[in-house]
């Protein structure tokens, strides 16, 4: 795959992933719950990072925002923070990667600068994707933990103002937003990796370390059928070789020695 194609594809994949992270963050269906077991109406409850909603069988829906910060679980705050950090990093990554795209010419920006920008945007996308994946996973873990805690406390009532508080045993399930978040985070991560791979191809040749091969003919004992003489190159019919043939040679040098790649 060409560098331009790899970079372009990485950018598009990251962009799709980033859009997914925003969508997941805004969605209300992070956790869902059916509350059929009540005498009035079938109720479907779903919760997001920002508000909790109730939809009834009649179609009526009421959503309430989490207006207080102090009363919210620390885990929810952490998930919010992770998703926002992921979005912010994604925005920066997109802006940087637009300027880094090989197919877009901006002034006299050389390939070295574009390579650095591509690497930077790739790293930003990777971190953004990781933030989203961690955020969604923390929320999912919180749901699972709460379910098992509610199972344990199912029969235990807590006194409240002389009354009774009972945990309702209804399973909260993973909402659509969790799956959107996982996929989006994964796409952003993959896109970032592709950008980092593209960066290597963008780096000008003279800035790369040259491949080096050494020639110490006496030491390179290669196995060849035909006994010791044939394998060591010290037979009577072998021409004399220098012990040290000018030290290191780069791949760019003329390939004048047939024994240059005689390694096993």
């Amino acid at each position: 795959m060409s560098v331009t194609a790899c970079q372009g594809l990485g950018f598009v994949v990251s962009l799709i992933g980033f859009a997914g992270i925003i969508a997941a963050t805004c969605m209300d269906q992070w956790s869902t719950q059916d509350l059929y077991n009540n005498p009035v109406t079938a109720v479907f409850n779903y919760q997001g990072l920002w508000r909790s909603c109730v939809r009834e069988s009649s179609g009526f829906t009421e959503c309430r925002g989490y207006f207080t910060l102090l009363g919210l679980p620390a885990m929810l705050q952490a998930v919010r923070a992770l998703m926002i950090v992921g979005i912010v990093l994604g925005v920066i990554g997109i802006l940087v990667s637009i300027f880094a795209l090989k197919c877009i010419r901006i002034g006299s920006m050389d390939d070295s600068a574009k390579a650095k920008m591509t690497l930077t945007s790739g790293i930003l996308f990777i971190i953004s994707g990781i933030c989203a994946i961690i955020g969604v996973s923390v929320f999912a873990n919180m749901l699972v933990t709460n379910f098992w805690m509610s199972t344990a406390n199912m029969y235990s009532g807590m006194g409240g103002m002389g009354g009774m508080v009972q945990t309702v045993q209804t399973r909260y399930t993973f909402g659509a937003a969790l799956f959107v978040g996982w996929v989006a985070g994964g796409l952003t991560l993959i896109g970032g990796v592709m950008m980092c791979i593209a960066c290597r191809g963008l780096t000008p040749d003279d800035s790369n370390f040259k491949a080096v091969s050494y020639h110490a003919s006496g030491q390179n004992v290669a196995y060849r059928p035909g006994g010791f003489k044939a394998s060591t190159g010290f037979g009577s019919n072998t021409r004399n070789k220098k012990i040290y043939d000018g030290g290191a040679r780069t791949e760019d040098d003329e390939q004048s020695h047939p024994t240059k790649y005689d390694y096993v």
């Epitope: 992070w30 509350l35 109720v43 409850n45 919760q47 109730v54 009649s58 885990m75 509610s150």
Partner: nanobody, 120 residues
Framework: QVQLQESGGGLVQPGGSLRLSCAAS????????MGWYRQAPGKQRELVAG???????NYGDSVKGRFTISRDNAKNTVYLQMNSLKPEDTAVYYC??????????????WGQGTLVTVSE
């Protein structure tokens, strides 16, 4: 923690009226259903009336046409207007709410009960 504050119970003559109210407070995200149950001495607890967030109502057979349930979603409060009271309506009336109190946490909360006595 979710608390319920009930009020409005008391002694009333047959044919009279009473208005019960129940306010929920504490850690509340949503209250999908609010309702009233009653328990007369030596009897099972029974549903009087229930109301959903959207206003869907359900009444016990013995109170239909005489009792009216309503709620104020903004105040997390449910009201029970009881008209044409009969001696057989004498019971302890319990407020009952279904509360979404956190992420993945739904509670059924019962009030401490308020006594309604219908007699001459």
């Amino acid at each position: 923690q979710v608390q319920l504050q009930e009020s409005g119970g008391g002694l009333v003559q047959p044919g009279g009226s009473l208005r019960l109210s129940c306010a929920a407070s504490g850690s509340i995200f949503n209250i999908p259903v609010m309702g009233w149950y009653r328990q007369a001495p030596g009897k099972q607890r029974e549903l009087v009336a229930g109301i959903s967030t959207g206003g869907t109502t359900n009444y016990g057979d013995s109170v239909k046409g005489r009792f009216t349930i309503s709620r104020d979603n903004a105040k997390n409060t449910v009201y029970l207007q009881m008209n044409s009271l009969k001696p057989e309506d004498t019971a302890v009336y319990y407020c009952n709410v279904l509360v979404v109190s956190g992420i993945g946490s739904t509670l059924e909360v019962w009030g401490q009960g308020t006594l309604v006595t219908v007699s001459e």
